[in-house]
Interface confidence: medium
């Protein structure tokens, strides 16, 4: 993994210490040849939680185009989920103040949907370079 990135189960992770909106965070990860983190398992969730600190943090899950989708194409419906009770609460309410179309880890690690412009921390994920 690159310097300052952490390795876990064949992927590399970078944890921000500043805040950006979801679109800005998404763009940042892409410029690093990565993507916003996709959570595939309870174990990966625990790893992320351990390193992110108790602060709202964006992940690569959004329903800006309608249904919830992971940025890397991982199937949302059949995949791992860790929403807070009664969340997400704005699936199709996009006319109400723009809706809450982007998912983030809350301070306890569980997920919430929120306004995508909120300046939260974020986590990038990339496949580990096999050569390293």
């Amino acid at each position: 993994c690159p310097v300052n990135w952490l390795e876990y189960e064949g992927s590399c992770y970078w944890f921000s210490r500043s805040g950006k909106s979801w679109p800005e965070a998404d763009k940042y990860c892409q410029l690093e040849s990565a993507h916003l983190v996709v959570v595939n398992s309870r174990e990966e969730q625990k790893f992320i939680q351990h390193h992110m600190g108790p602060v709202n943090t964006w992940m690569g899950l959004t329903d800006q185009s309608g249904p919830w989708k992971w940025v890397d194409g991982t199937d949302y419906e059949t995949g791992f989920k860790n929403w807070r009770p009664e969340q997400p609460d704005d699936w199709y309410g996009h006319g109400l103040g723009g809706g809450e179309d982007c998912a983030h880890f809350t301070d306890d690690g569980r997920w919430n949907d929120d306004v995508c412009q909120r300046p939260y921390r974020w986590v990038c994920e990339a496949a580990r370079d096999p050569a390293t």
Epitope: S18, G19, L96, G97, E100, D114, V115, Q117, P119
Partner: antibody
Framework: QVQLVESGGGVVQPGRSLRLSCVAS????????MHWVRQAPGKGLEWVAV????????NYADSVKGRFTISRDNSKNTLYLQMNSLRAEDTAVYYC?????????????WGQGTTVTVSS | DIQMTQSPSSLSASVGDRVTITCRAS??????LAWFQQKPGKAPKSLIY???SLQSGVPSKFSGSRSGTDFSLTISSLQPEDFATYYC?????????FGPGTKVDIK
């Protein structure tokens, strides 16, 4: 009780510098983001800057970007605003305010304010 | 930047009146809106956060609501101590922005 006390205001000439301080008490300072907000005479409220609980993230209003610097010393429970290249339009009462969260959730507690007058 | 507009800019009311002030955001901010009260020569005081949640210690005569990007602050029965200027504020994204204020004075 939760309290914020600003100091450092005064009369200063255009182009000069001033540093404001805000001392916090009655809560765990290092767990909260902090903001500076100002109010020109007879005008409304204008947000100036925010610093996250741990100092990792700082954001500024366009009107002060490049001239003002927000900082904090968690060991002293103190927030600072370094104001350089002051202009007449910076004349205002400056308030520090606590963010209920780490720095992205607005303000819940305000100080009493300190007055800055920029005049030749 | 997100622009906040408030209406009316001022209003005259009598003690006991029900008063409603509205605030509109130029784009979606979810529930990330607060209301503040300010009296002359004093610091602002937080009344409402998250569009409709009452700050601790604030009397229940104050209430907030949201409909899309429109927000309102209602004072159910105006008392002499409520004559002041009221500001809305969005904290959905930086820069944080305030509305221009609504001055509530005695009729």
């Amino acid at each position: 009780q939760v309290q914020l006390v600003e100091s450092g205001g005064g009369v200063v000439q255009p182009g000069r510098s001033l540093r404001l301080s805000c001392v916090a008490s009655g809560f765990t300072f290092s767990s909260h983001g902090m903001h500076w907000v100002r109010q020109a005479p007879g005008k409304g409220l204008e947000w100036v800057a925010v610093i996250w609980y741990d100092g990792s993230n700082k954001n500024y209003a366009d009107s002060v970007k490049g001239r003002f610097t927000i900082s904090r010393d968690n060991s002293k429970n103190t927030l600072y605003l370094q104001m350089n290249s002051l202009r007449a339009e910076d004349t205002a009462v400056y308030y520090c305010a606590r963010d209920p969260s780490v720095g992205y959730d607005g303000m819940d507690v305000w100080g009493q304010g300190t007055t800055v007058t920029v005049s030749s | 930047d997100i622009q906040m507009t408030q209406s009316p800019s001022s209003l005259s009311a009598s003690v006991g009146d029900r008063v409603t002030i509205t605030c509109r955001a130029s784009q979606g901010i979810g529930n990330h809106l607060a209301w503040f009260q300010q009296k002359p020569g004093k610091a602002p005081k937080s009344l409402i956060y998250a569009a409709s949640s009452l700050q601790s210690g604030v009397p229940s005569k104050f209430s907030g609501s949201r409909s899309g990007t429109d927000f309102s602050l209602t004072i159910s029965s105006l008392q002499p101590e409520d004559f002041a200027t009221y500001y809305c504020q969005q904290y959905s994204n930086y820069p944080v922005t305030f509305g221009p204020g609504t001055k509530v004075d005695i009729k």
